[in-house]
């Protein structure tokens, strides 16, 4: 969370940004809020990126002005126009690329004053893992798969019954490059699993952490997955 202040004569407004992460090949959002102003035509929003000449995006007089937009962002950005009057200057970014990572500035000018704040935008790939019982194996085993990660994550297994146990000797993890030659598919197999136990497969890089849980009993298999972005908010 970054809060910036601006001064315009005696007036300043608070601009707030949130460090966030973008999943490459998907939509991303650069979050920025400011003190609302009911006069839409008096609001100017400028998004800038460190090291880039020209603007990422500009919104003024109630509409987009892309006359100074840098080519790498052409056709890839939009503000949430209907939410500008309530203080939302967040930017929607299409088809996030690795090269979109960096420091962005959200600059706001309204009839109340002006202000700006920076945000760090990280880019990579992250996805939910899915755990299944691998019946093909010679002994009962679990297979944890997640389709897209970048940079290469670490993978660790844990179990409810054997808390603190190191499963690296009884697991095998592989990383397979996906067709776009950037992200990788993560596959980890845990061998010699026991029934009536809950196992967790944890995948983590510097952008996100994902966990898949599986509980195997005689009568059923229960699964749960969650994903959290690191260092955001």
């Amino acid at each position: 969370l970054i809060i910036g202040f601006g001064i315009s004569g005696k007036h300043f407004i608070t601009v707030t940004t949130f460090t966030s992460a973008g999943n490459i090949g998907e939509d991303g959002t650069l979050s920025c809020t400011f003190e609302p102003d009911i006069k839409l035509n008096g609001i100017v929003i400028q998004w800038l990126k460190e090291g880039i000449k020209g603007l990422v995006h500009e919104f003024k007089e109630g509409k987009d002005d892309l006359s100074q937009q840098h080519e790498m962002f052409r056709g890839r950005t939009a503000v949430f126009a209907d939410q500008v009057v309530v203080g939302n200057a967040s930017l929607r970014l299409k088809n996030v690329q690795l090269t979109d990572a960096g420091t962005y500035t959200c600059y706001i000018r309204t009839s109340k004053g002006k202000g700006n704040a920076n945000l760090e935008y990280k880019t990579g790939a992250f996805s939910m893992p899915e755990i299944n019982v691998d019946y093909n194996a010679s002994s009962e085993s679990l297979r944890c798969e997640a389709p897209r990660w970048f940079p290469q994550p670490t993978v660790a297994w844990a179990s409810q019954v054997d808390q603190g146990a190191n499963f690296s000797e009884v697991s095998n993890t592989s990383f397979e490059l996906n067709s776009e030659n950037v992200t990788m598919k993560v596959v980890s197999v845990l061998y010699n699993v026991t029934i009536n136990n809950t196992y967790s497969c944890m995948i983590e890089n510097d952008i996100a952490k994902a966990t898949g849980d599986i509980k195997v009993t005689d009568s059923e298999v229960k699964r749960r997955s969650q994903l959290q972005l690191l260092n955001s908010g």
């Epitope: 490459i24 090949g25 509409k63 892309l66 056709g75 992200t183």
Partner: antibody
Framework: EVQLVQSGAEVKKPGASVKVSCKAS????????IGWVRQAPGQGLEWIGD????????NYNEKFKGRVTITRDTSTSTAYLELSSLRSEDTAVYYC??????????????WGQGTLVTVSS | DIQMTQSPSSLSASVGDRVTITCKAS??????VAWYQQKPGKAPKLLIY???TLQPGVPSRFSGSGSGRDYTLTISSLQPEDFATYYC?????????FGQGTKVEIK
């Protein structure tokens, strides 16, 4: 309501040029990309290119580069497709379509009624 | 440029059938795949965008899914008004590309 109204059918000779218009209403013309798509008789859809009326920025299918020009007139909220050096294979229905997402180039969500261009000697 | 290979080119089905149409991108990954329905003499109609988001007003029997290079349009229970030609569109890159189309005919 978003509406795109295209100009009428055209018959052209090989080697000539054609200019098709697409008049937009029901939204802020300068805030959304407009694309052009064609469909030859009995064939599939083929993307030609698009334009951002707010700045005049264009993208073109490599297949048509050098033969196609997409322009706009913001005063009349009209987009134009001009295709030169026409040949018989250019006989098709030409559609204009608004791209969803305003300055973000989205999918084509609203379409014109189409303009039949016939190229025949 | 990314090409979209759509299959099958045509299929015959009955009312109530579950129908699946697929599109395979020649390269890369992005979720920017849309699906259109077109009836003879009419302009295409947007059904689904961003892989799986249903366009407002489109019946819920239409659904989209996919990831990586493979994308699918599913009609869960075919209705008489669904007999038409369907196209996928890749719109994530600078250059857009349609699939070749799938004609859904009455068996």
């Amino acid at each position: 309501e978003v509406q795109l109204v295209q100009s009428g059918a055209e018959v052209k000779k090989p080697g000539a040029s054609v200019k098709v218009s697409c008049k937009a209403s029901g939204y802020t013309f300068t805030s959304y990309w407009i694309g052009w798509v064609r469909q030859a008789p009995g064939q599939g859809l083929e993307w030609i290119g698009d334009i951002y009326p707010g700045g005049g920025y264009t993208n073109y299918n490599e297949k048509f580069k050098g033969r196609v020009t997409i322009t706009r007139d913001t005063s009349t909220s009209t987009a134009y497709l001009e295709l030169s050096s026409l040949r018989s294979e250019d006989t098709a229905v030409y559609y204009c379509a608004r791209l969803d997402g305003s300055s973000y180039r989205g999918a084509m969500d609203s379409w014109g009624q189409g303009t039949l261009v016939t190229v025949s000697s | 440029d990314i090409q979209m290979t759509q299959s099958p080119s045509s299929l015959s089905a009955s009312v109530g059938d579950r129908v699946t149409i697929t599109c395979k991108a020649s390269q890369g990954f992005n979720k920017y795949v849309a699906w259109y329905q077109q009836k003879p003499g009419k302009a295409p109609k947007l059904l689904i965008y961003y892989t799986s988001t249903l366009q407002p007003g489109v019946p819920s029997r239409f659904s989209g899914s996919g990831s990586g290079r493979d994308y699918t349009l599913t009609i869960s229970s075919l209705q008489p008004e669904d007999f038409a030609t369907y196209y996928c569109l890749q719109y994530g890159n600078l250059l857009y590309a349609f699939g070749q189309g799938t004609k859904v005919e009455i068996k």
